[in-house]
């Protein structure tokens, strides 16, 4: 076990941060919940404090969520692929580009650490180049989210990951809009860390609204994963 | 804004159980992270356990762990604090209290950081 991974073995509360701006409309998200990692469970609910999100919802739940991977789920086997975990608690700096297909981008930077006993997720995001009646700023995108599956690989150069993948958001009209991330993970702290074999986490993410809220917000329940790497030739033959 | 009426105290003996209730008017109780405090006679107001909204992050002072559980259900607005093996230390007046759920962790022991307070209710427990 990392010794930042023994900060993760019960229910851990959770603080997200953001302030955008998304073709100059500028907003902010506060989200609170707590994270299981045992589980790989997530509860998440976030407010614009903004008033209303200039955004839709889905577009954000990677740079909230996919932001506090170290929530993931890491069977037995995979334990040592666990680069989130083992950046704690200083915790990593996470950089991502979107791009949304036939329409712009968001650029994110992030950092994801514990202060005192509540992991932290303080995120900045510019976005250029939307179309202002396109799926994202034209708010035509429907209000769920699909299971995806985020690849890493290890980046020995900056002593971190790098992470990709492909989100498919669900759009009214019965279509879908694209969105390719590019994602880099750096440790904050000069501890060692774990750099893992190529593997994957595979999430499931529903999305849901709190009746009695009257701000603009999203309520999100996600379960994560480790997966594909295979347990060695030892552990068959045991 | 949300506001407290706590219920359940009383007088037991050494060993009884209680069960505490508190039940929230004015606002939506999901909206806060809650907790117990409680004032022994003669002494400051101390912390006993938080809960977060969801119900399942849960935090207890050392001296109340494995005896009391705290638990909620916001379908019922209310909060509760299932008290087990009291002792004569256990005499108290127990306070509900809750903080806005977004921009403040559950995980908080301090007093200040609870901005809505019950009126109390008296629980002694007697050799």
């Known amino acids: 076990m990392s010794k930042g991974e023994e900060l993760f073995t019960g229910v851990v509360p959770i603080l997200v941060e953001l302030d955008g701006d998304v073709n100059g409309h500028k907003f902010s998200v506060s989200g609170e919940g707590e994270g299981d990692a045992t589980y790989g469970k997530l509860t998440l609910k976030f407010i614009c404090t903004t008033g209303k999100l200039p955004v839709p919802w889905p577009t954000l739940v990677t740079t909230f969520s996919y932001g506090v991977q170290c929530f993931s789920r890491y069977p037995d086997h995979m334990k040592q692929h666990d680069f989130f975990k083992s950046a704690m608690p200083e915790g990593y700096v996470q950089e991502r580009t979107i791009f949304f297909k036939d329409d712009g981008n968001y650029k994110t930077r992030a950092e994801v650490k514990f202060e005192g006993d509540t992991l932290v997720n303080r995120i900045e995001l510019k976005g250029i180049d939307f179309k202002e009646d396109g799926n994202i700023l034209g708010h035509k995108l429907e209000y769920n989210y699909n299971s995806h599956n985020v690849y890493i690989m290890a980046d020995k150069q900056k002593n971190g990951i790098k992470v990709n993948f492909k989100i498919r958001h669900n759009i009214e009209d019965g279509s879908v809009q694209l969105a390719d991330h590019y994602q880099q993970n750096t440790p904050i702290g000069d501890g060692p860390v774990l750099l893992p074999d190529n593997h994957y986490l595979s999430t499931q993410s529903a999305l849901s609204k709190d009746p009695n809220e009257k701000r603009d917000h999203m309520v999100l329940l996600e379960f994560v994963t480790a997966a594909g790497i295979t347990h060695g030739m030892d552990e068959l033959y045991k | 804004q949300v506001q407290f009426v706590e219920s359940g105290g009383g007088t037991v003996q050494d060993g009884d159980f209680l069960r505490l209730s508190c039940t929230a008017s004015?606002?939506?109780?999901?909206?806060?992270?809650a907790g117990w405090f409680r004032q022994p006679p003669g002494r400051e107001r101390e912390f006993v356990a938080a809960?977060?909204?969801?119900?399942?992050?849960?935090l207890y002072a050392d001296s109340v762990k494995g005896q009391f559980t705290i638990s909620r259900d916001n379908a019922k607005n209310a909060m509760y604090l299932q008290m087990n093996r009291l002792k004569p230390e256990d005499t108290a007046v127990y306070y509900c209290?809750?903080?806005?759920?977004?921009?403040?962790?559950?995980?908080?022991?301090?007093?200040?950081?609870?901005?809505?307070w019950g009126q109390g209710t008296q629980v002694t427990v007697s050799s």
């Open positions: 809960i977060s909204w969801t119900g399942e992050g849960t």
């Open positions: 209290a809750a903080a806005r759920s977004v921009g403040f962790t559950w995980r908080s022991s301090k007093s200040n950081d609870y901005a809505y």
């Open positions: 004015g606002d939506t109780f999901s909206n806060y992270h």
